[in-house]
C-alpha cells in the first residue's frame, strides 16, 4: 500500500489505473512513503525489483534502500518530464550486482549518490559519465558513496575490481566536480595511479578498511582542496618520503592513519621524523608498531633513530633454509 504523507490533493494511487493514464506529478508510488514538504520519497525495505516509474516530480531525496533491484539499466531514472529536482539518491543495500552505462542519465541535479552495500560484479565505465566520449558532459555529482561494493569472490569479473571502479571514476573526466568520495571496505589492494588526478576537486576521500599495502604509486599532489583523507584499517607498512612531502604540501588536509600494521625498521625513520613535526595526522599519538615482534605496540612518536634498525641481509651462501 502507498503511504503518502504528502499534503497534495491528488487522487490516491490506483495500481490498476497506472498504465491507463500518465502518472500525476505529485502522487506517491505504491510501497513508498512520500513527503512533499520534505521533498522526500522513501521506498525502503520493500523488495522492489525495479525503480518505481511514477515518482513524484517534487522529489529531491530518494531512498531506494533495502530492495532487490539486481540491475540498474541505462536511463533507470529517465522520466518525461525529467526528475529535475532529484538531488540525493540512496540505493544502498538493494542487492545491485550490475550498474550499466547511463544508469543515472537525465538527472540534471543529482548531487549525491550512494551505492554502498551492493555487490557490484559489474560497474560500467560509463555508469557516472553517461557516455563513452573521451570528454563527456560534466556530471553534477558532488558526493559519491561507494562503501562495501565489492562482490563475493565467485562473482568477480576477470579484470581487477580496483580497475573496474577506477574506470568508472575517470571516464570522460565527468567527475571533476566531485567533493566527496567514499570507497571504504572494498578489499582494495592498490589505488590505480590515474584516479586521483581526474578528481581535482576532492575535499573528502575515504579509503578506510581496505587492504592497501603501499601508497608509493599514488599521487595526492593535485588534490589541493583535500580536507580529510581516511586511510584507517588498511595494510600500510610505511609511508615513504614522496608521499610524506605530498601530504605536507596540501594546505587543508587532515590524515587518519589508525590501525595499520606499521613496520618499525630502518625504513620507518623518515616517517617517524615527519610524524613528530607534522600537524597533518589526526590522532598521531595512537599510531603503534605491529612489526617486528620486538617493536610491537611501541608508539611511533616515541621512537628514535636508534630504535629503527634493519636486520642485515645475509649473503645467499650463509642463509639457511
Amino acid at each position: 500500500t502507498s503511504s503518502a504523507s504528502s499534503s497534495s490533493s491528488s487522487a490516491p494511487f490506483l495500481a490498476s489505473a497506472a498504465s491507463a493514464q500518465p502518472p500525476l506529478p505529485d502522487q506517491c508510488p505504491a510501497l513508498c512513503e512520500c513527503s512533499e514538504a520534505a521533498r522526500t520519497v522513501k521506498c525502503v525495505n520493500r523488495n522492489l525489483t525495479e525503480v518505481p516509474t511514477d515518482l513524484p516530480l517534487y522529489v529531491r531525496n530518494l531512498f531506494l534502500t533495502g530492495n532487490q533491484l539486481a540491475v540498474l539499466p541505462a536511463g533507470a531514472f529517465a522520466r518525461r518530464p525529467p526528475l529535475a529536482e532529484l538531488a540525493a539518491l540512496n540505493l544502498s543495500g538493494s542487492r545491485l550486482d550490475e550498474v550499466r552505462g547511463g544508469a543515472f542519465e537525465h538527472l540534471p541535479s543529482l548531487r549525491q549518490l550512494d551505492l554502498s552495500h551492493n555487490p557490484l560484479a559489474y560497474l560500467s565505465p560509463f555508469a557516472f559519465s553517461g557516455s563513452n566520449a573521451s570528454i563527456s558532459a560534466p556530471s553534477p555529482l558532488v558526493e559519491l558513496i561507494l562503501n562495501h561494493i565489492v562482490p563475493p569472490d565467485d562473482k568477480r569479473q576477470n579484470r581487477s575490481f580496483e580497475g573496474m571502479v577506477a574506470a568508472a571514476l575517470v571516464a570522460g573526466r565527468a567527475l571533476q566536480g566531485l567533493h566527496l568520495l567514499e570507497l571504504a571496505s572494498n578489499h582494495f589492494l592498490y589505488l590505480p595511479r590515474d584516479v586521483l588526478a581526474q578528481l581535482p576537486s576532492l575535499r573528502y576521500l575515504d579509503l578506510s578498511n581496505n587492504s592497501l599495502v603501499s601508497l608509493t604509486y599514488v599521487s595526492f599532489r593535485n588534490l589541493t582542496h583535500l580536507e580529510s583523507l581516511h586511510l584507517e584499517d588498511n595494510a600500510l607498512k610505511v609511508l615513504h618520503n614522496g608521499t610524506l612531502a605530498e601530504l605536507q604540501g596540501l594546505p587543508h588536509v587532515r590524515v587518519f592513519l589508525d590501525n595499520n600494521p606499521w613496520v618499525c625498521d630502518c625504513h620507518m625513520a623518515d616517517m617517524v621524523t615527519w610524524l613528530k613535526q607534522t600537524g597533518v595526522v589526526q590522532g598521531k599519538d595512537r599510531l603503534t608498531c605491529a612489526f617486528p615482534e620486538k617493536m610491537r605496540n611501541r608508539v611511533l612518536l616515541e621512537l628514535n633513530s636508534a630504535d629503527l634498525d634493519c636486520d642485515p641481509i645475509l649473503p645467499p651462501s650463509l642463509q639457511t633454509s
Epitope: 504523507s5 514538504a37 540525493a88 558526493e143
Partner: antibody, heavy 122, light 107 residues
Framework: QVQLQQWGAGLLKPSETLSLTCAVY????????WTWIRQPPGKGLEWIGE???????NYNPSLKSRVTISVDTSKNQFSLKLSSVTAADTAVYYC????????????????WGQGTTVTVSS | EIVLTQSPATLSLSPGERATLSCRAS??????LAWYQQKPGQAPRLLIY???NRATGIPARFSGSGSGTDFTLTISSLEPEDFAVYYC?????????FGGGTKVEIK
C-alpha cells in the same frame, strides 16, 4: 558557512504592510528552503511560509491571503510581505534557511537571522 | 494541519540530572521531526533533525528518538547552559508546525 542578516521596519500602524528582507552571505541559494517564522511576545514559534531556489512557495493557510514571500537570486536575498497588519501580528520575525538535500557536509544545516521585532500599534 | 503536543510544559531539574522531553503528533510525521533550543533574546538553534540525527556541533548529551507520532528528546546530563525552552517541529506536511514548547528550568 551561510549567514543571514535581516532588516525592515519595526513599527507599523494597523492596516499597513509589513516588509522584511533577509540577505544570505557565504553560500548558495540552491538546496535551501528559505523560511519566515514569527514568535509573538512570550509565545511559541509560528511558521509563516517558505520559498526554494526554484521560487516555489508554500504558506501557512492561516496567513496565506496576506503573505507574499519572494526571492531575488541576483542579490542573494529573500523577502516577506504581510499586508493589512493588526496588533495580533506583533512578534519577533525570523528568517531562516534549512538545507534539505542529503549532502554529507550540509544536510541538517540550519541557519537563522537575528530576528526583527515588529510592533503594530496605532 | 498536524498538531504537535509537547509535555511537560515545564521541567524543573538540577544540573547533572537527565531530562526527557516528549512530543506527540496528531498524525504520523514519519521521521520528519526536528528539535530546537531557544534561550531568551536569541533565535532558536537546531539540535536534532530527522528525529534522531544530531546537528553539526551539538554535544553528544543530546539525543532524539521516535518515529510516527511519538518522539523524545533526551539530555543525558544537564549542563548549566542547557536550561532553555525546547520546541519540536514537523516537516512532513504543510503547514510546518511547532509544538508549544517545554521549558527546562533550574530546580
Amino acid at each position: 558557512q551561510v549567514q543571514l542578516q535581516q532588516w525592515g521596519a519595526g513599527l507599523l500602524k494597523p492596516s499597513e504592510t509589513l516588509s522584511l528582507t533577509c540577505a544570505v552571505y557565504g553560500g548558495s541559494f540552491s538546496g535551501y528552503y528559505w523560511t519566515w517564522i514569527r514568535q509573538p511576545p512570550g509565545k511559541g514559534l509560528e511558521w509563516i511560509g517558505e520559498i526554494d531556489h526554484s521560487e516555489s512557495t508554500n504558506y501557512n493557510p492561516s496567513l496565506k491571503s496576506r503573505v507574499t514571500i519572494s526571492v531575488d537570486t541576483s542579490k542573494n536575498q529573500f523577502s516577506l510581505k504581510l499586508s493589512s497588519v493588526t496588533a495580533a501580528d506583533t512578534a519577533v520575525y525570523y528568517c531562516a534557511g534549512w538545507f534539505g538535500e542529503l549532502y554529507h557536509y550540509y544536510y541538517g544545516m540550519d541557519v537563522w537571522g537575528q530576528g526583527t521585532t515588529v510592533t503594530v500599534s496605532s | 494541519e498536524i498538531v504537535l503536543t509537547q509535555s511537560p510544559a515545564t521541567l524543573s531539574l538540577s544540573p547533572g540530572e537527565r531530562a526527557t522531553l516528549s512530543c506527540r503528533a496528531s498524525q504520523s510525521v514519519s521521521s520528519y521531526l526536528a528539535w530546537y533550543q531557544q534561550k531568551p533574546g536569541q533565535a532558536p538553534r537546531l539540535l536534532i533533525y530527522d528525529a534522531s540525527n544530531r546537528a553539526t556541533g551539538i554535544p553528544a548529551r543530546f539525543s532524539g528518538s521516535g518515529s510516527g507520532t511519538d518522539f523524545t528528546l533526551t539530555i543525558s546530563s544537564l549542563e548549566p547552559e542547557d536550561f532553555a525552552v525546547y520546541y519540536c517541529q514537523q516537516r512532513s506536511n504543510w503547514p510546518l508546525t511547532f509544538g508549544g514548547g517545554t521549558k527546562v528550568e533550574i530546580k
